[in-house]
Interface confidence: medium
Amino acid sequence: MSKGEELFTGVVPILVELDGDVNGHKFSVSGEGEGDATYGKLTLKFICTTGKLPVPWPTLVTTFSYGVQCFSRYPDHMKQHDFFKSAMPEGYVQERTIFFKDDGNYKTRAEVKFEGDTLVNRIELKGIDFKEDGNILGHKLEYNYNSHNVYIMADKQKNGIKVNFKIRHNIEDGSVQLADHYQQNTPIGDGPVLLPDNHYLSTQSALSKDPNEKRDHMVLLEFVTAAGITHGMDELYK
């Protein structure tokens, strides 16, 4: 077990803070909830603290919760590939470019680390080149979320990882909006981290609303499990 992994044996409180600017529309979001890495489970609620969110909530899911991939459940035989927990408590910087097909792009930078016993994800997001009447600024996405695989590989030069995946957002007219994600994570501290073999995270997310909440908000339940690396040969012969 890595030193960082020991911090995730129980339920951990999570705080998310985002400042965003998309085509000049500035906004802020606060999120709170908890994560349980034993089950790969995240429960979070987000509110837009500046009024109405200028972009659809589903376009921010990867920035919020795929941002705290330290809560992914890594099976016993894959624990030596869990970069995310090994970087804790000092944490990691997570940078992404998200290209929305035939539309604009988000660039995000986040610092994910422990502050006290709370896991904090502080994010800056800049979005440019979006069409005012497109699927994103035109709010044409359905309020739901598909399952995805998130592919992880080591980046030995930067003592971190590179991550690629493609999100499929459902559009109200029945079509799909693709969002290509290019991600890199580098540790904040200078302690040892685990550099993984290639593998993937399998994610399932459910979006809902709080019937008592008047502010613009999103409630998120997510399960994430690491996969893609088989047991070693010695396991097969047990």
Partner: nanobody
Amino acid sequence: VDQLQESGGGSVQAGEALRLSCVGSGYTSINPYMAWFRQAPGKEREGVAAISSGGVYTYYADSVKGRFTITRDNVKNTMYLQMPSLKPEDSAKYYCAADFRRGGNWNVDPFRYDYQHWGQGTQVTVSS
């Protein structure tokens, strides 16, 4: 927290409004859970409203639900209680409370939670 300081109390007529503020000093990192309590003479202290550290979760006592609004500004380390259309039964000394601990039962019942830090209180008097 070095100090919690309430302000904004006063004497008003029924139907008028007040906004209470509670400023915290002496902390820089994670913001605390916070709550407003009140105590009228000869009565027990009761919870009024509570708010989570990021302002995402809010809780209200049944007696003020739909009337009062709790908010916070984490840049200013300040919590607010907006109290429009006050009633004589809202008369009491209002206290703010704060707690930095995590992973407890705060969200189960924030009014029965054992808060670490308390202010000195501000008096609200509503006459008919």
